[in-house]
Amino acid sequence: QDSRGCARWCPQDSSCVNATACRCNPGFSSFSEIITTPMETCDDINECATLSKVSCGKFSDCWNTEGSYDCVCSPGYEPVSGAKTFKNESENTCQDVDECQQNPRLCKSYGTCVNTLGSYTCQCLPGFKLKPEDPKLCTDVNECTSGQNPCHSSTHCLNNVGSYQCRCRPGWQPIPGSPNGPNNTVCEDVDECSSGQHQCDSSTVCFNTVGSYSCRCRPGWKPRHGIPNNQKDTVCEDMTFSTWTPPPGVHSQTLSRFFDKVQDLGRDYKPGLANNTIQSILQALDELLEAPGDLETLPRLQQHCVASHLLDGLEDVLRGLSKNLSNGLLNFSYPAGTELSLEVQKQVDRSVTLRQNQAVMQLDWNQAQKSGDPGPSVVGLVSIPGMGKLLAEAPLVLEPEKQMLLHETHQGLLQDGSPILLSDVISAFLSNNDTQNLSSPVTFTFSHRSVIPRQKVLCVFWEHGQNGCGHWATTGCSTIGTRDTSTICRCTHLSSFAVLMAHYDVQEEDPVLTVIT
């Protein structure tokens, strides 16, 4: 006890009344007004509580403090008086702050600041929206992924800052009258092939696809090693040359040199070189047959094999190369008598006649093209007089029924040796390689050496045997008429043809021999 009569045990935030009692300081309260035991406490009075009589007025907030309180202007408001705190409504001078004016960059990019009582809002420009985690930041609306699907299905949506575009997809273009970009854009597929916008190599053919194109190897061409077909960057090489190589088992330097030339011509071959390449191959063949060199020392059968291989390969090569020629008629002739006549056309509905020195061929254009082949129609005729040297003593194989008929009536008459080749050997080909059964026959008129009287003249073709060699045959070919130095033949297939003179006497009007023709 204090000698002056003041209790020393008064709790915190209280003052003594006398030696035995204390009272809470202003702003604090206890269970009873007078505190008589040290166990009691003085607790802060919250003047800002709802039941309190304190009123700070509008646009303000009451802030409780230890033993007191303060009135302050609410966020977004400030006191006109400049006093940061006040005690009651009568001292309240709070008014709205215009944050937008105070800080013009408050809404950052792409937003406009709008003042509100006690605050502000950011209004985003068209094409932007407020970021949920930062309501002051306007971010771009991606119209393309927002599910609005604002573009036509023929276009693709391209989002950009604050907007979007509807652009034609690659390989598409706006339909006539349509813009390219606004949301009313409508597009259609570009035909890169017909418009010339493709990048196809000249060894390929352009094929349009929806929204794109592809490059496919030309007929008779194959993709270069390691490059796939049907791509935009496909590059092809001509198969024509790669398959025409010397026949196996034949050893001839002259023949090897010929095939070396063929391979050389094929190495850097391009479609535009077709004309020169055809001429060079025929020139090389003409020279080979004019001076066969060591070919002439080969056994007869091997010579026939070489001839068969040359005829077969030449036909394939010429067919392949001629598809790259431009429309028109070509005639080439060479010193040793080799001659080529060639007509290239977009298919026409008429018959075609190719005339040469020693042969004329007539057939229907419709035969020339395989249905569905996009290339031009080609009809070709090669006369190869030099081939006669290699085909000397080549056998004639008649159909069994003709053979039997002859044996019954002319026993022993065919034992006199091989038939004689009267005409040049000619080879006929079309762009269509399916010529085994023509829908309308082909007619050949041969000029040839004089026929020995009472000898039988036969129209024959060279049949390539399974052994890679071959023989003369008459199947599908008939002799329409023959005079001393000319014969007309009609055949229902294409191959290499000639006129032979058979070694037996023809009886007057012999009906059996008529069967042969």
């Epitope: 011509l265 391009k270 535009g272 060079s280």
Partner: antibody
Amino acid sequence: QVQLQQSGAEVAKPGASVKLSCKASGYTFTNYWMQWIKQAPGQGLEWIGAVYPGDGDTRHTQKFKGKATLTADKSTSTAYMEVSSLRSEDTAVYYCARGFTAYGMDYWGQGTTVTVSS
Amino acid sequence: EIVLTQSPATMSASPGERVTMSCSASSSVSYMHWYQQKSGQSPKRWIYDTSKLASGVPARFSGSGSGTDYTFTISSMEPEDFATYYCQQWSSNPLTFGGGTKLEIK
């Protein structure tokens, strides 16, 4: 008649590039390869490479890969050769010539003299 | 690459003389061509495909050969024939020229 007209003489500094042209007339530009040949002073003929105008395909000798760039413009029937990173040993007459395997180089341009000097 | 070796490198001849020069290839060649070049002029194709004379080339010139050995012949030299002659192969890439044979007046 067939003609190959080459661009005029060039004088260039080491490290620079020159682009030579060869304008063809009198034949179908895409029916032959266009060859480029170098002839250094007092030396023989040296093949650089060839360009096929039909599709821009090129052939090069190893020595000139990366050194000479061959191109062709079908629309103007002109072949071009750009020689880069020039050095004194690139001083030469450069010829263009029309070529085909079986015929050799049947027509030649008049040549373009390139002098590399600092 | 196919190397073409021409021999001789230089030769002298008199008008009327028969001249033969050769071109030897390191590998077999199918298409061999020959060119004539006079000083300060572009080369001219002279013989192509081994033996065919280019347009305007006189008949006194001839070519022959096969495989790796080729020959260029002038049956009777004329004053205008003095020049350098190059052989060239086109049977494999890269295309190559011989080093040339310079034909001088004796």
